[in-house]
């Protein structure tokens, strides 16, 4: 893979340890927490990033209505188990033997159980709805300009091909970005929508995962777009399985 050869760093993941111990003295980078080798020419998987984050020292109407099966990441951070490819294992457990099933973006999709809980497959999240509220501006942004700039951002910064940005909706001050990527659409080398959404989420929070890259400076026709709230909904290819108790809570 390509890491910055001159100073041996990982441009796409600052939560790595890099050294020139690859084949032929090439720079090789390993993710903190897991020690797994990462491809620095593309985004690192969300699972490896979460694992690295948990190992690091702690620091302080045109709009879409998410479907009844949309998941929100209410559980927050946890130390995930990743498979050899860096994907989330379908079953995650904590230190107290409480287990649950997750989707491909690591969000819980079942009730919590014990070690007997079975998660037969890693269910793919094929539709992500990123719901943003921007800070007040003099006037509303032009919808088509906003759409174009956000598509450009996902292509330029996160390597996500425009075909996976299904739509951009705008009703001031709410912006919704729909990412869609079915298993059949994702070719070798394509960035996963879950990874792109995670990098975007961290960028929006001012916690960029890139090494030495400037922070996110999003502008629409020169006007800064500053986000004050983000909510992300995840839709899986198979609806989640929660008990009625949770649904009525």
């Amino acid at each position: 893979h390509t890491a910055a050869q001159d100073n041996c760093t990982c441009p796409t993941n600052k939560m790595t340890v890099c050294s020139p111990d690859g084949p032929g003295g090439r720079c090789q980078c390993r993710a903190l927490g897991s020690g797994m080798a990462v491809d620095c020419s593309t985004l690192t998987s969300k699972c490896l990033l979460l694992k690295a984050r948990m190992s690091a020292p702690k620091n302080a109407r045109t709009l879409v209505r998410p479907s009844e099966h949309a998941l929100v990441d209410n559980d927050g951070l946890y130390d995930p188990d990743c498979d050899p490819e860096g994907r989330f294992k379908a079953r995650q457990c904590n230190q107290t033997s409480v287990c649950w099933c997750v989707n491909s973006v690591g969000v819980r999709r079942t009730d919590k159980g014990d070690l007997s809980l079975r998660c037969d497959e890693l269910v793919r999240t094929h539709h992500i709805l990123i719901d943003l509220r921007h800070r007040p501006t003099a006037g509303a942004f032009n919808h088509s300009d906003l759409d174009a700039e956000l598509r450009r951002l996902f292509r330029e910064r996160y390597r996500l091909h425009p075909k996976f940005v299904a739509a951009v909706h705008y009703e001031q001050p709410t912006i919704q970005i729909e990412l869609r990527q079915n298993t059949s659409q994702k070719a070798a080398g394509d960035v996963d929508i879950g990874d792109a959404a995670y990098y975007f989420e961290r960028d929006i929070k001012g916690e960029s995962l890139f090494q030495g890259r400037g922070g996110l400076d999003l502008r629409v026709r020169g006007e800064p777009l500053q986000v004050e709230r983000t909510l992300i909904y995840y839709l899986d290819e198979i609806p989640p399985k929660f008990s009625m108790k949770r649904l009525t809570a």
Partner: antibody, heavy 120, light 107 residues
Framework: EVQLVESGGGLVQPGGSLRLSCAAS????????MSWVRQTPAKGLVWVST????????YYSDSMKGRFTISRDNAKYTLYLQMNSLRAEDTAMYYC?????????????WGQGTLVTVSS | DIQMTQSPSSLSASVGDRVTITCRAS??????LAWYQQKQGKVPKLLIY???NLADGMPSRFSGSGSGTDFTLTISSLQPEDVATYYC?????????FGQGTKLEIK
């Protein structure tokens, strides 16, 4: 007026190396994705490589990956293509091309090209 | 990789004729298709993007149509200055490919 001027082509022996340059002017270079495309009478136009505006995202044609390295210097308004282990089949006219601003990978401006000949 | 096949490879038509060139993708590419015009001894010039959008400065007699796998470039009334080779190119994936070209001549 957008201008792209390639240089660095010439005659090189098989196994040799060349570094092509493309000097850009007439637009804000640091905001555009850039590419190299080559052309031969036999194969027509063939995409070689693309680099995004800040140089973080790079794509290569599968058939050229490993031998060619694309890079850019935004301060100098210059795009580069380092070509190693050259083969006879790399003989072509090499064009530097600007991608559309919104990063859809089609080419809205092309340079005049620089000819690379690989022969012993 | 996605293969792009143009037909015909060459064609000859009279001034004023309606000319169509087709481009077929080996798999669905939605509307991620561009057409270029390259005159003899010149560099390629963007003609159409997103399958149907005419590039700035190109004459309105050129138009593009199609989506999915089948695309057409049409010249409504052929002019002498349209003599060139025309190429299609997909940008649906990260591996970009061009058609082999269609050489257009005047009868």
């Amino acid at each position: 007026e957008v201008q792209l001027v390639e240089s660095g082509g010439g005659l090189v022996q098989p196994g040799g190396s060349l570094r092509l340059s493309c000097a850009a002017s007439g637009f804000t270079f640091s905001t555009y994705t850039m590419s190299w495309v080559r052309q031969t009478p036999a194969k027509g136009l063939v995409w070689v490589s693309t680099i995004n505006s800040d140089g973080y995202n790079i794509y290569y044609s599968d058939s050229m990956k490993g031998r060619f390295t694309i890079s850019r210097d935004n301060a100098k308004y210059t795009l580069y293509l380092q070509m190693n282990s050259l083969r006879a089949e790399d003989t072509a006219m090499y064009y530097c091309a600007r991608c559309s601003y919104y990063s859809y990978d089609y080419f809205d401006y092309w340079g005049q090209g620089t000819l690379v000949t690989v022969s012993s | 990789d996605i293969q792009m096949t143009q037909s015909p490879s060459s064609l000859s038509a009279s001034v004023g004729d309606r000319v169509t060139i087709t481009c077929r993708a080996s798999e669905n590419i939605d509307n991620y298709l561009a057409w270029y015009q390259q005159k003899q001894g010149k560099v390629p010039k963007l003609l159409i993007y997103a399958a149907t959008n005419l590039a700035d400065g190109m004459p309105s007699r050129f138009s593009g149509s199609g989506s999915g796998t089948d695309f057409t470039l049409t010249i409504s009334s052929l002019q002498p200055e349209d003599v060139a080779t025309y190429y299609c190119q997909h940008y649906y994936s990260n591996q970009l490919t061009f058609g082999q070209g269609t050489k257009l001549e005047i009868k």
